[in-house]
């Protein structure tokens, strides 16, 4: 009699995640009787994937009825596949016995599976920097495959040279993972930026995926402090302006300070944006002359963003001749430099 | 599933000529969707895409002479001053549902004559 | 770009032969490989995807295997209706773009 086949026409069988898979398997004879099951894997460390007889196979389904008499098809039907479920899947007869005796397996059909990669997740650094020094930032996209995969950086619409990109693992395996490192150079301007990286895949539908983080949550812009002089009023008040400029984040907190005392205190709150994202703030202070005998150093001193404190002073003269009402005066900047990096 | 191309017809040098390519059976906001030609006894070649957001890439050799577009349900191929080396049967053609590296759906393709 | 050589250009032969067509990259393309039939006043129409994928319907005499920069399309035992024209496609992942083989020309002998 005709030996007995077990044919699997397909060597190789490719899916995307979340689909279905059809393994097609049929024999050549009803002979010798005995049942047929499917595996993942050869060897003795194979995996049972189906047997009609007895077990619980949640997604394998036969695509024909098995109990029907004379079959011949033991074709399955794998639903909602993910990359774990790639690998070589062989059917396989049986002699029926007490155990039943494996007779013959099929030739194997390789199960490719393609899954598109996760969208990009980008972070940046933990700590806010200033204009000039160099912040990482991180992209990450999971589960795709194959391992063939593009990533660019962009900066507001440029392509980012100084990136170093990573794909794990290095060998063989059911889906892969991408990370990749841009560093970029902060400038004053950067308030309103953003980077993008971007990521392309043979599954994804000529679109590549996008992830975006914005300058804003990793930028510093120090503030420029000016105190100036407004005018001496018939009163013997003097007004003396405090004028904090280019600054972000708006998180601020400024004290005046009248020959080192505690004069008042304010924090900035609902500021209106400059166009390039910053912002600037003018607080007033009006000293009465007349009830001082000396000179008055005033000191406007700024917290910006929890760094420490910059200060600018400027001294009130106090005179038998009081300035023209309308006169401008400059501060002398007993403080540090005016355009502070910290 | 189903593509048919239109618009093909015979025109002067330096004419333009915008074809069409009209799917049924799935929609063009889920796939890839491709322009190639023929010229008559040479092999096939690659004009460009349109990604399922209406992104189009295009073949170097392109140069800005070809734009491709597209509507609800159709794909379109606009041909600036055609030249006679432009004659060719022109295909449209769907990438497969795994990944944008081949195309399983092919229009019957439509006939360019450019000749004076 | 990448370029596509196919070999043979055409060949000649008999209903039943085996017939291998070759198609090699200019750079290594991975498995992104695809094998396309075409008749006279035809359409291309799919056979091979990911340099060994029978797409769906194709009768099983047709297979593919390579990958890299070397590939090959084998039809087992040539039927009647498998005499017409054979195209590789390529796509590269980092450019995005498509190239063809120049084509195999399968005629009766």
């Known amino acids: 009699e005709e030996e007995l086949q077990v044919i699997q026409p397909e060597k190789s069988v490719s899916v995307a995640a979340g689909d279905s898979a059809t393994l097609n398997c049929t024999v050549s004879s009803l002979i010798p009787v005995g049942p047929i099951q499917w595996f993942r894997g050869a060897g003795p460390g194979r995996e049972l994937i189906y047997n009609l007889k007895e077990g619980h196979f949640p997604r394998v389904t036969p695509v024909s009825d098995p109990t029907k008499r004379n079959n011949m098809d033991f074709s399955i039907r794998i639903s909602n596949i993910t990359p774990a479920d790639a690998g070589t899947y062989y059917c396989v007869k049986f002699r029926k016995g007490s155990p039943d005796v494996e007779l013959k397996s099929g030739a194997g059909t390789e199960l490719s599976v393609r899954a598109k990669p996760s969208a990009p997740v980008v972070s940046g650094p933990a700590v806010r920097a200033t204009a000039e020094h160099t912040v990482s930032f991180t992209c990450e996209s999971h589960g795709f495959s194959p391992r063939d995969i593009t990533l660019k950086w962009f900066k507001n619409g440029n392509e980012l040279s100084d990136v170093q990109t990573n794909v794990d693992p290095a060998g063989k395996s059911v889906s892969y993972s991408i990370r990749s490192t841009a560093r970029v150079v902060l400038t004053r301007r950067d308030v309103h930026s953003q980077v993008i990286c971007e990521v392309a895949h043979v599954t994804l539908q000529g679109d590549p995926l996008r992830g975006t983080a914005n300058l804003s949550e990793a930028i510093r812009v120090p503030p420029f402090l000016e105190v100036t002089q407004q005018s001496m009023r018939a009163d013997n008040q003097v007004n003396v302006t405090c004028q904090v400029t280019k600054f972000y984040p708006q998180r601020l907190q400024l004290t005046w300070l009248e020959n080192g005392n505690v004069s008042r205190t304010e924090m900035a709150s609902a500021l209106p944006e400059n166009k390039d994202g910053t912002y600037n703030w003018t607080s007033w202070l009006l000293v009465n002359v007349s009830a001082h005998r000396d000179d008055v150093k005033l000191t406007c001193q700024v917290e910006h963003d929890g760094q420490p404190a910059v200060n600018k002073s400027f001294s009130v003269k106090v005179s038998a001749h009081p300035k023209e009402q309308g006169s401008n005066t400059a501060a002398e900047n007993t403080g540090t430099n005016e355009r502070n990096i910290y | 599933v189903q593509l048919v191309e239109s618009g093909g017809r015979l025109v002067q040098p330096g004419t333009p000529l915008t074809l069409s390519c009209t799917v049924s059976?799935?929609?063009?906001?889920?796939?890839?969707m491709g322009w190639f030609r023929q010229a008559p006894g040479k092999g096939l070649e690659y004009i460009g895409i349109?990604?399922?957001?209406?992104s189009p890439y295009y073949a170097s050799w392109v140069n800005g002479r070809f734009t491709i577009s597209k509507t609800s349900t159709t794909m379109d191929l606009k041909m600036n001053s055609l030249r006679s080396e432009d004659t060719a049967t022109y295909f449209c053609?769907?990438?497969?549902?795994?990944?944008?590296?081949?195309?399983?759906?092919w229009g019957p393709g439509t006939l360019v004559t450019v000749s004076s | 770009d990448i370029q596509m050589t196919q070999s043979p250009s055409s060949l000649s032969a008999s209903v039943g032969d085996r017939v291998t067509i070759t198609c090699r990259a200019s750079?290594?393309?991975?498995?992104?490989l695809a094998w396309y039939q075409q008749k006279p006043g035809k359409a291309p129409k799919l056979l091979i995807y990911?340099?060994?994928f029978l797409y769906s319907g194709v009768p099983s005499r047709f297979s593919g295997s390579g990958s890299g920069t070397d590939f090959t399309l084998t039809i087992s035992s040539l039927q009647p209706e498998d005499f017409a024209t054979y195209y590789c496609?390529?796509?590269?992942?980092?450019?995005?773009?498509?190239?063809f083989g120049q084509g195999t020309k399968v005629e009766i002998k």
């Open positions: 496609q390529s796509w590269h992942y980092i450019s995005r773009s498509y190239t």
């Open positions: 349109i990604s399922s957001s209406g």
């Open positions: 750079q290594s393309i991975n498995s992104y």
């Open positions: 990911s340099a060994s």
């Open positions: 059976g799935f929609s063009l906001s889920s796939y890839v």
């Open positions: 053609a769907r990438v497969g549902p795994l990944g944008v590296d081949y195309f399983n759906i």
